[in-house]
Each structure stands twice: as C-alpha cells, then as structure tokens.
C-alpha cells in the first residue's frame, strides 16, 4: 500500500506558483464547535537555532492534476516541493541551476518535509465510472534535518531541538503531518 | 508499518480522570493523524476525536467537549487521551487509531490493542 | 449531532450474498462522506474493510467491496464464510468529525 498512488500520478505540471487552491466547500457539520480550544499542533520553526536567518531550505510550489488508477483530479492541486541542500540563507540560489550549493564540512543538513496536510479532491474516471473522493497528503512546510555519521539516511535528525508537545497549540491553515514513505518517492526531488 | 501500543487496564472512581497513552513505532507520531474510539461493554463503537489535517487541528465529538484532552509528546512518540469527571457510564474499551501515511490519507487503518477503563465506586 | 443508522442484524447463507446499509440522519450519503467499514470479532479491535467508499486494503478480502446505493453507503459481501460471522461498523466524515453507524451483527448460518 503506502504510496503506490503516487508513482501513478500524473506529472501534468501547470506553470502557476501561486497559493494552495481553495478546498471544497464544507459538508454540513459544526466544525468550530468542536475544535480544541488550542487544537492545532503548533507551528514549527524549521531552524530553531541561536540565529533563525542563518540556514535556509527552498520550497519550491508546482501544479498538477492527481491520479488515482485511471481516476484523474477535477482540478489541480497546488504541491510544494522541498528542494536542495540546507545551508547559510545568503549562499543559497533563488532559482534552480543558480548560485553555488554550500556544502557543511561538518553533519549534512538536508531540506525535507516538515508538515503535511490534506486536500479533498474529487477525482473523475473514464467510461462513465462514478467519481471518488479522496484526501491527498501534501506538504506543507520543509525544514532542515542533520545527518550525522553517526547516523544513516533514515535516522535524520531534527535541525534544532522540537519540544515535546503536550497540548497541541491553534495553528494557521495548512497544517498536517505527514510519511516517512513519501520520502523515498521523492528523494530526487530533495 | 504503523504499530501502536497502548497502556494497561485502569479502574477509577467517579468524578475522577484517567490518562491513556498511545505508543507509536514504524513512524513518528508527528507523522500521523490519532484518533480515538470508545467502545463500552456490549455496545458500538464511538469517536471521540481526533486530529484532523485538513485544518491541523484536534477536533472533539460534541459529546466530549469539555472533558476529554489530546494531547501528544513527539519526543517518546506517545499520544495521550485523557477524560476527566469519570461517570459510570465511561466504562470501557478505550482505543487509538492512525492512518497508513500513505500518499492518500485512510483514517483508522491501524489499531491499538485497547486500554480498559472501568469506572465504579 | 448526525445519526448514523445501520441495520442492526443480518443473516446470510454460506455462499450468499448480503448487502449492509449506512444513512445518515443528514440525507443522503456522498462520496464526500468518506464512508468506512469495519469489521469486529468478539475480543478483538475493529479491523478496517474499505475506506473512502469503496477503497479496500491490501488486507479486505476480495468477497467484500464498498458502494454507494439509494443514498447511503453499502457493503457487500458476496459468497459469504463462516469467518465473515462479525459485527460490522460504517463511519461517516462530517468536515473531520466523524460518526460510527450503531454496527451490524451479521450471522453467517
């Protein structure tokens, strides 16, 4: 199981970078009524280091129509990419294929998913099958994770210390977690 | 694969709280959506809440709100469900959920084995 | 607080085919109820059948398969067996609240 999906998708990349497209309407429901009073985990800081500037990590955003077997999204959803190595934000290129990639001497630092969330879509199917609705994991946000020797490529480590949550704090939209699984689908991307 | 463990039986007096924990292995919790379901003895199944990634948020079946708290420690990857104010009627198998952290989100793929809490004076 | 409604018990023949409900109090079931199906033996945790209406998982046996039918979710079990003796829960997802159906006991007999 696990991300079989993914390796079907359509790659139909559509030139837009713009902000995530806007979900569905909700079904019927009292959703804020039954909200957390401080529900959402809480944002996290992809560098939590002495000087928050000092390191950067690109999220690159692209376009494209989801599949599902045969199914295809009705719409395009907006996805963001994690792209390149961690490094001082004044040395990294603000495109692809610009600048020199600085490389630590010391542990690898590496951008990668942070957060993930879900997007209703609707998916339409040929020959007149009915239509499916799923919720797709995007990511959200990337952050920088150290690999040190001491450790391999599935043990990165956090970039920065994450305090343990007891009580999950009110977080902006959007904001889910998300697969380890994803990662090795999109190593290239990273 | 997600595998999740949780804590022992617990017996409680009315009127006051219990704390049930959830371990997480295979992922991290903060990888993964936890929700939790009741089931009393002889009855059906009944969702108290969980969190849901669409808005990041914890959300709580009306019938709870007010009672019940999730709450999670990502550093020991354990989820915690804790219902205070204990009544009779919160007997029961206690149960934490996850979904498979797959590229399409499936809620309550995997099982936790059950934490029993009787509630009597 | 929605209702969801299952029939609460069911008979089947071995070999034969059953179909089980799921309503909602709200109207019709959609797709954008996500229904789920899960499955209970006595002691055991519920195992989940079919997700997102009539998604099945690497573990569903292949005689199960999930729809949508006159306005609510169905499971249909086609050539039952003895093991398929089970009380059967629907859930339906109202905007990431979710509600179970009261369970189906189904007897295989």
């Known amino acids: 199981q696990g991300w079989q999906a993914f390796k079907n998708d359509a790659t139909e990349i559509i030139p837009e970078l713009g902000e995530y497209p806007e979900p569905p309407p909700e079904l019927e429901n009292n959703k804020t009524m039954n909200r957390a009073e401080n529900g959402g985990r809480p944002p996290h800081h992809p560098f939590e280091t002495k000087d928050v500037s000092e390191y950067s990590c690109r999220e690159l955003h692209f376009t494209r129509y989801v599949t599902d077997g045969q199914c295809r999204s009705a719409k395009p959803v907006t996805e963001l990419v994690c792209s390149g190595q961690c490094g001082p934000a004044r040395l990294l290129p603000n495109a692809i294929g610009r600048g020199k990639w600085w490389r630590p001497s010391g542990p690898d630092f590496r951008c990668i998913p942070d957060r993930y969330r879900a997007q209703r879509v609707q998916l339409l199917c040929p020959g007149g099958a009915a239509p499916r609705a799923r919720k797709v994991r995007l990511v959200a946000s990337c952050k920088c994770k150290r690999l040190t020797r001491f450790h391999n490529q599935s043990e990165l480590k956090d970039f920065g210390p994450e305090a343990a949550r007891p009580q999950k704090g009110r977080k902006p939209r959007p904001r889910a977690r998300g697969a380890k699984a994803n990662q090795a689908e999109l190593e290239n991307a990273y | 694969e997600v595998q999740l463990v949780q804590s022992g039986a617990e017996v409680k007096k009315p009127g006051a709280s219990v704390k049930v924990s959830c371990k997480v292995s295979g992922y991290t919790l903060s990888e993964l959506s936890i929700h939790w379901v009741r089931q009393a003895p002889g009855k059906g199944l009944e969702w108290m809440g969980g969190?849901?990634?669409?808005?990041?948020?914890?959300i709580y079946a009306q019938k709870f709100q007010g009672r019940v708290t999730m709450t999670e420690d990502t550093s020991t990857d354990t989820a915690y469900m804790e219902l205070s104010s204990l009544r009779s009627e919160d007997t029961a198998v206690y149960y934490c959920a996850t979904d498979s952290a797959g590229y399409w989100y499936k809620f309550f793929q995997h099982w936790g084995q059950g934490t029993l809490v009787t509630v009597s004076s | 607080q929605a209702v969801v409604t299952q029939e609460p018990s069911l008979t089947v023949s071995p070999g034969g085919t059953v179909t089980l409900t799921c309503g909602s109090s709200t109207g019709a079931v959609t797709i954008d109820h996500y229904p789920y199906w899960f499955q209970q033996k006595p002691g055991q945790a519920p195992r989940t059948l079919i997700s997102d209406t009539d998604d099945k998982h690497s573990w569903t046996p292949a005689r199960f398969s999930g729809s949508l039918l006159g306005g609510k979710a169905a499971l249909t079990l086609s050539g039952a067996q003895p093991e398929d003796e089970a009380e059967y829960y629907c859930l339906l997802d109202y905007g990431g609240s979710f509600v179970f159906g009261g369970g189906t006991k189904l007897t295989v007999l």
């Open positions: 969190f849901d990634p669409e808005d990041g948020e914890t």
